[in-house]
């Protein structure tokens, strides 16, 4: 069966939107009005992995781009990157582990934990216009809570 996907945007708990910053980076900033069109639309795919009521394995691709968020070790540190893939082969039910995030729902907020690096989360800074990154702390200065907005296909 083909992998199930939905289109959505994400905003952090401070209402910052995610936009492209160069070809392989996302940044978070406050957008208003027509600028909202700049925000990236994700194709969120529901993939194979350990699942529970509040934890669902997903892959986050950029809609109509052959780019996926992936988590790899760079200089011994878990790092978030945008990785290009062959569009003929993606998305797929069995994604490589670096592409998988555990989507965790807590109090109407979402966290995205790396399946490859437990307790590392997609994060944004308090500051404006900073890169989206993989953070190893929750509940500190950095933001790990998001809301999801559905986008029609």
């Amino acid at each position: 069966a083909p992998v199930r996907s939905l289109n959505c945007t994400l905003r952090d708990s401070q209402q910052k939107s995610l936009v492209m910053s160069g070809p392989y980076e996302l940044k978070a900033l406050h957008l208003q009005g027509q600028d909202m069109e700049q925000q990236v639309v994700f194709s969120m795919s529901f993939v194979q992995g350990e699942e529970s009521n509040d934890k669902i394995p997903v892959a986050l691709g950029l809609k109509e781009k052959n780019l996926y968020l992936s988590c790899v070790l760079k200089d011994d540190k878990p790092t978030l990157q945008l990785e290009s893939v062959d569009p003929k082969n993606y998305p797929k039910k069995k994604m490589e582990k670096r592409f998988v995030f555990n989507k965790i729902e807590i109090n109407n907020k979402l966290e995205f934990e790396s399946a490859q690096f437990p307790n590392w989360y997609i994060s944004t800074s308090q500051a404006e216009n900073m890169p989206v990154f993989l953070g190893g702390t929750k509940g500190g200065q950095d933001i790990t809570d998001f809301t999801m907005q559905f986008v029609s296909s």
Partner: antibody, heavy 120, light 107 residues
């Protein structure tokens, strides 16, 4: 010091099930990011990746053999197992287990291999 | 599946030579390439990972380079103990696939 050692039946007949064990020391499969894979090599030929199991139980298989393969682990006993059902003479090979941490994988440590012959 | 091609299946060189072994992927593999040495007794060792990073304990005469679809392993000053077969492995996409190997012999 990391060591891995494969064990198997040596010889078995076509249509039987091949059961392989990888016993390892020097690392734990409960460590985040850790994985163990199986790779085989027919005599005088190249290497073929078969299956991989991660610390969290996540499994990956080579689709060309997926219906025949089952990988599993016993974390407390430091062992990983591979079962291949309905073997044929083409499955005659040396079978290696190897350790890789994180994806993309680099197989950092390898066992010495165990030769399996399928013959009627 | 991603095909990994090592066009040279065997290579003959003299001690002290600089030897280059190449590996080509059927599509871009984002530098997710590692190199392995298999000695005549069957022992396999990791040499290089992530295209160019030298695994700990591997002599510095070994180096790796490449990008996109084309990758290479270089031995700068061939020694007797380097007589072995060398394999590349792509980790970009499941199933992970090896090159066919390049057997290195002494002239």
């Amino acid at each position: 010091q990391v060591t891995l050692k494969e064990s198997g039946p040596g010889i078995l007949k076509p249509s039987q099930t091949l059961s392989l064990t990888c016993s390892f020391s020097g690392f734990s499969l409960s460590t985040s990011g850790m994985g163990v894979g199986w790779i085989r090599q027919p005599s005088g030929k190249g290497l073929e990746w078969l299956a991989h199991i991660w610390w969290d139980g996540d499994e990956s298989y080579n689709p060309s053999l997926k219906t025949q393969l089952t990988i599993s682990k016993d974390t407390s006993r430091n062992q990983v197992f591979l079962k291949i059902t309905s073997v044929d003479t083409v499955d005659t090979a040396t079978y290696f287990c190897a350790r890789a941490r994180y994806d993309p994988p680099w197989f950092v440590d390898w066992g010495q291999g165990t030769l399996v012959t399928v013959s009627s | 599946d991603i095909q990994m091609t090592q066009t040279t299946s065997s290579l003959s060189a003299s001690l002290g030579d600089r030897v280059t072994i190449s590996c080509r992927a059927s599509q871009d593999i984002s530098n997710y390439l590692s190199w392995y040495q298999q000695k005549p007794d069957g022992t396999v060792k990791l040499l290089i990972y992530y295209t160019s990073k030298l695994h700990s304990g591997v002599p510095s005469r070994f180096s790796g380079s490449g990008s996109g679809t084309d990758y290479s392993l270089t031995i700068s000053n061939l020694e007797q103990e380097d007589i072995a077969t060398y394999f590349c492995l792509q980790g970009k996409m499941l199933p992970w696939t090896f090159g066919g190997g390049t057997k290195l012999e002494i002239k």
